[in-house]
């Protein structure tokens, strides 16, 4: 409810003031009042609200001698640096008895040189990519009108009649300036200038070019570049191990990558020091005096299979009565792919040599026919993959089983499709 | 006791313009801010604006800067707000309603006209 | 602007029911929240102000709390006079703003 209507006079004997001025203006609010007995506490109200923590100080002076004489109450306002939030109309408010009095209005106004709400900001851009860029300032005074500046050379004829917060530039080919003036009733305020870097495109048609086991040719299509040759590209490779992850455009890999220079033109690139036979993702980026160009998203490329560079290892022969027992190790060197399996010459010293494929059984038991007179026998083992056989073994002699020595333990694998050897010579 | 008195039921053809008034009694009108509010057919309240009938001071909110107009006759007490280039949108219920000054600052509305129905209509 | 939102905007309980209406205001409006009751023939009434200082001559069922940007109404008895629209409205920062409204009917 009311505190009661207003029947008597105002106590009010001075009222606000207008402030009128720019962003940052300290001004100050003053109002009196005469009141009989004990001072009211002044409140200050902007556009009917009350100030709760407005910076106001009250001074009370006593007119007569008695506590029931009349006061006079000065409250003054202070409004530091003026903001567009401190405008409207400003009043003091006193509770007297059941009574509420306000005084007079007295406005604060805000009028000055245009300010910036927000101004161009520096950026990269591909060379000949539209961008837009942005610039909003205000008064009061309105209207506030802007003009575009490229290189300090203004957009339009005159403000306002160019682009106003937006502006859309269709492409650059050289890095350049932006700036935008904000004009009004007042005068013009200049925004920051912002630097517009033109970078390289994104290079285009990443490819394979040629494949080995160890290294990758690739090749792609430089972007344009605007005014600046491009001085290198620059390829990066990473594996792409099981369940990594990289997908088209995703951001870093999770390990460091393998970075190659390449000079330009051309734009090719022999990637070397590769592991075989192992899926890598590659991506290639160009740069030019301005800077580099955003990287290709990853394409995934892999290494073909090599063959294994070494032969198998600890070969062991050993002949008794009519069976050779030959058995191996894997090779210890690396196999460049997927092992398939082995191969096994053997060769009388007046014989030609007999070419077994054992598949990936690591021993055989040859069947020998005949009273194995056959002298100087030795055995050779070699590895393959799908790329072709690995180094041969140097030759092992087969040497006659004495008893006493440990008997290996071999099966004899007599499949259908793959007879049991003999000698033919024998 | 403070009362809000507003004008009755107006049709009107769109394009046209429309006043519409509220008159106070009951307090000192040169003291307090009338406030204009506006309820569209089914829909919440929208603040339209102020005005200080001891300065003639006024303000709007953003949306209704173009469309309304307040203004008050202190002789007679009475605050009116003016619609203009109306169209079927701007059929609602509009209330005066009169601000209070509280230590607390802030702003509420204790009290209110019985609303004025504008109907825009060919 | 500061969005006002209450999320039930029809509610139905039955006399004697304790409810409960709440209001979210968009950013914190320190504790100048508003409570109106609109009655069907559209008369508006203040009930609440300052969060929960109940108006003069407004029943002490009608209780108000909340801070920051939550706040809600609470009406803790249920009488058939209470059946009205019941709005929030922040009273923080121009332009005042009003929630869209929850209606309270009868089971």
């Known amino acids: 409810a009311p505190r009661g209507t207003q029947a008597e006079e105002s106590p009010f004997v001075g009222n606000p003031g207008n402030i009128t001025g720019a962003r940052g203006l300290t001004g100050t609010l003053r109002c009196q009042l005469q009141v009989q007995g004990e001072p009211p506490e002044v409140h200050w109200l902007r556009d009917g609200q009350i100030l709760e923590l407005a910076d106001s100080t009250q001074t009370q002076v006593p007119l007569g001698e008695d506590e029931q004489d009349d006061w006079i109450v000065v409250s003054q306002l202070r409004i530091t640096s003026l903001q567009l939030s401190d405008t409207g109309q400003y009043q003091c408010l006193v509770f007297l008895g059941h009574q509420t009095f306000v005084s007079q209005p007295g406005y604060v106004g805000l009028e000055g040189l245009p300010y910036f709400l927000e101004e161009p900001e520096d950026r990269t851009v591909a060379a000949n990519t539209p961008f837009n860029l942005s610039c909003q300032a205000q008064g009061p005074p309105e209207p506030v009108d802007l003009l575009w500046l490229q290189d300090a050379v203004p957009l339009a004829t005159a403000p306002g009649h160019g682009p106003q917060r937006s502006l859309h530039v269709p492409g650059l080919n050289k890095t350049s300036s932006f700036s935008c003036e904000a004009h009004n009733a007042k005068g013009v305020t200049t925004s920051r200038t912002a630097t517009i870097t033109v970078l390289p495109q994104q290079p285009r048609n990443l490819h394979l070019v040629s494949r080995q086991p160890t290294e990758l040719e690739v090749a792609w299509t430089p972007g344009l570049s605007g005014i600046y040759p491009l001085t290198h590209c620059t390829l990066q490779a990473v594996l792409s191990d099981d369940g990594m992850g990289i997908q088209a455009g995703e951001p870093d890999p999770p390990e460091e990558p393998l970075t190659s220079q390449a000079s330009v033109p051309p734009h090719q690139l022999r990637l070397g020091s590769l592991h075989p036979h192992t899926p890598y993702h590659i991506r290639v980026a160009c740069t030019s005096s301005q800077g580099p160009s955003s990287w290709t998203h990853w394409l995934p490329v892999e290494t073909p299979e090599g063959v294994p560079l070494g032969p198998p290892e600890n070969i062991s022969a050993t002949r008794n009565g009519s069976q050779a027992f030959v058995h191996w190790q894997e090779p210890r060197a690396p196999l460049q792919g997927t092992l398939l399996g082995y191969r096994l010459a053997y060769q009388g010293q007046d014989t030609p040599e007999v070419l077994m494929d054992i598949g990936l059984r690591q021993e055989v038991t040859l069947e020998l026919q005949g009273d194995g007179s056959v002298s100087n026998l030795t055995v050779c083992v070699a590895a393959y993959t799908a790329a072709g056989d690995g180094p041969w073994s140097l030759p092992v002699p087969l040497e006659a089983w004495r008893p006493g020595q440990a008997q290996p333990v071999h099966q004899l694998v007599k499949e259908p499709s793959t007879p049991a050897f003999s000698w033919p010579w024998w | 006791q403070v009362q809000l008195q507003q004008s009755g039921p107006e049709l009107v053809k769109p394009g046209a313009s429309v006043k519409i008034s509220c008159k106070a009694s009951?307090?000192?009108?040169?003291?307090?801010?009338i406030h204009w509010v506006q309820q569209r057919p089914g829909q919440g309240l929208e603040w339209i604006g102020w005005?200080?009938?001891?300065?003639?001071?006024?303000k709007y909110n953003e949306k209704f800067k173009d469309k309304a107009t307040l203004t008050a006759d202190t002789s007679s007490g009475t605050a009116y707000m003016q619609l203009s280039s109306l169209t079927s949108d701007d059929s609602a219920v509009f209330y005066c309603?009169?601000?209070?000054?509280?230590?607390?600052?802030?702003?509420?509305?204790?009290?209110w006209g019985q609303g004025t129905l504008v109907t825009v209509s060919a | 602007d500061i969005q006002m939102t209450q999320t039930t905007s029809s509610l139905s309980a039955s006399l004697g029911d304790r409810v409960t209406i709440s209001c979210r205001a968009s950013?914190?409006?320190?504790?100048?929240l508003n409570w109106y009751q609109q009655k069907p023939d559209g008369t508006v009434k203040l009930l609440i102000y300052?969060?929960?200082r109940l108006h003069s001559r407004v029943p002490s069922r009608f209780s108000g709390s909340g801070s920051g940007t939550d706040y809600s109404l609470t009406i803790s008895n249920l009488e058939q006079e209470d059946i009205a629209t019941y709005f929030c409205?922040?009273?923080?920062?121009?332009?005042?703003?009003f929630g869209g409204g929850t209606k309270l009917e009868i089971k």
């Open positions: 005005i200080y009938p001891g300065s003639d001071n006024t």
């Open positions: 950013q914190d409006i320190n504790y100048y």
């Open positions: 300052y969060t929960s």
């Open positions: 309603a009169r601000n209070y000054y509280d230590y607390d600052g802030g702003t509420w509305f204790p009290y």
């Open positions: 009951g307090y000192s009108f040169t003291s307090y801010y």
């Open positions: 409205q922040q009273g923080n920062t121009l332009p005042w703003t």
